[in-house]
């Protein structure tokens, strides 16, 4: 969480951002909030990116003002106009690109004053893993698959019964480049699986951590998946 304060002749206002991550090819949100102001026509929201000459986005007098927008963001940005009234200046970024990563500044002007805060935006690919029993294998085998990751993640297996055990000798992980030549499909196979146990396939890079659990008993198979973005720090 980053909290910024204004620094000019006018009063300063508090602006708060949250570091976040974008999943390439999908839409992302750059979070920013500020002290709401009753005089809506005075509210100006500017999004800037370090190293980019033009603006990422500008909203003033109740509408988008995109004449100064940088080419790389053309047609890809929007603020939530209905939420500006409650102090939400968050930016929606469509079709996130790898090159969108960097330091952004959320700069706010209201009738009460000015303020800004920076935001670190990471980009990559992350997806939920699915763990299945591989019935084609000669022994009891689990197969963990996740369709899109970047940068290349690490894959670690764990089990509820053998807590702390190292499964690297009885597992095999491969990374297959997807058709867009950036993201990769992750496939990890775990051998010599015992029944009545819960196994977890944990996939992690510097952007996200995802876990796929599978519980195999004689009567049923239960699955659960969970994905968590890392470094969501507010400022």
């Amino acid at each position: 969480l980053i909290i910024g304060f204004g620094i000019s002749g006018r009063h300063s206002i508090t602006v708060t951002t949250v570091a976040s991550a974008g999943n390439i090819g999908e839409d992302g949100i750059l979070s920013c909030t500020f002290e709401p102001d009753i005089k809506l026509s005075d509210i100006v929201i500017q999004w800037l990116k370090e190293g980019v000459l033009g603006l990422v986005h500008e909203f003033k007098e109740g509408k988008d003002e995109l004449s100064e927008q940088d080419e790389m963001f053309r047609g890809r940005t929007a603020v939530f106009a209905d939420q500006v009234i409650v102090g939400n200046a968050s930016l929606r970024l469509k079709n996130v690109q790898l090159t969108d990563a960097g330091t952004y500044k959320c700069y706010i002007i209201t009738s009460k004053g000015k303020g800004n805060a920076n935001l670190e935006y990471k980009t990559g690919a992350f997806s939920m893993p699915e763990v299945n029993v591989d019935y084609n294998a000669s022994s009891e085998t689990l197969r963990c698959e996740a369709p899109r990751w970047f940068p290349q993640p690490t894959v670690v297996w764990a089990s509820q019964v053998d807590q702390g055990a190292n499964f690297s000798e009885v597992s095999n992980t491969s990374f297959e480049l997807n058709s867009e030549n950036v993201t990769m499909k992750v496939v990890s196979v775990l051998y010599n699986v015992t029944i009545n146990n819960t196994y977890s396939c944990m996939i992690e890079n510097d952007i996200a951590k995802a876990t796929g659990d599978i519980k195999v008993t004689e009567s049923e198979i239960k699955r659960r998946s969970h994905l968590q973005l890392l470094n969501s720090k507010a400022s």
Epitope: P36, I38, L40, K63, V84, I85, V86
Partner: antibody, heavy 116, light 107 residues
């Protein structure tokens, strides 16, 4: 000095509609949101809806969805609130107010009585 | 939808004494909270916004505090004109919900 002047008291039949006006003076009308807040006899304040002329958007409380319509005429600096399918429990004082997000100026209120 | 609650429902205080009115939100509203005063037969009046900022013309005996979900309006030395109903209101999210109010009456 900002002033919000509302239309006069009304008596309405159940099932009919009401339309209350609110004329603003003393500041740029479209620079602010205008909200409607009602107060039933002996009860608290209830936010109904808000319009943001500068954004061209309106918001209603879920409770009034489909029954309330708010409009704003920038040329006359007047906001309107129409409530349809009136029932006895809509008997209240209806206030127009400048805002959100919070409300710094209020109209004098319009008493609407719904009775057969 | 955020639910606002206020306590007590009625507060009896003597003139010159201090009064503390409580407001609670069902989830965090950050600093997006306002207080209003309403006297019988009159429209409400904005007292405080942004938890602690007094509106224009509001005397400094009115003070707001708190953050997140718990808020307090303190009136340091009650004057006869301070009696009436007090409402808190959140503006973190649409819809703009008011609390049920606290009636401040003369003891």
């Amino acid at each position: 000095q900002v002033q919000l002047v509302q239309s006069g008291a009304e008596v309405k039949k159940p099932g009919s509609s009401m339309k209350v006006s609110c004329k603003a003076s003393g500041d740029t009308f479209s620079s602010y949101a205008i909200s409607w807040v009602r107060q039933a006899p002996g009860q608290g304040l209830e936010w109904m809806a808000g319009i943001i002329p500068v954004f061209g958007t309106a918001h209603n409380a879920q409770k009034f969805q489909g029954r309330v319509t708010i409009t704003a005429d920038k040329s006359t600096s007047t906001a309107y609130m129409e409530l349809s399918s009136l029932r006895s429990e809509d008997t209240a004082v209806y206030y127009c107010t400048r805002g959100g997000p919070y409300f710094d100026y209020w109209g004098q209120g319009t008493l609407v009585t719904v009775s057969s | 939808e955020i639910v606002m609650t206020q306590s007590p429902a009625t507060l009896s205080v003597s003139p010159g004494e201090r009064a503390a009115l409580s407001c609670r939100a069902s989830q965090s509203v950050s600093s997006n909270l306002a207080w209003y005063q309403q006297k019988p037969g009159q429209a409400p009046r904005l007292l405080i916004y942004g938890v602690s900022t007094r509106a224009t013309g509001i005397p400094d005996r009115f003070n707001g505090s708190g953050s997140g979900t718990e808020f307090t309006l303190t009136i340091s030395s009650l004057q006869s004109e301070d009696f009436g109903a007090y409402y808190c209101q959140q503006y973190k999210k649409w819809p703009f919900i008011f609390g049920p109010g606290t009636k401040l009456e003369i003891k």
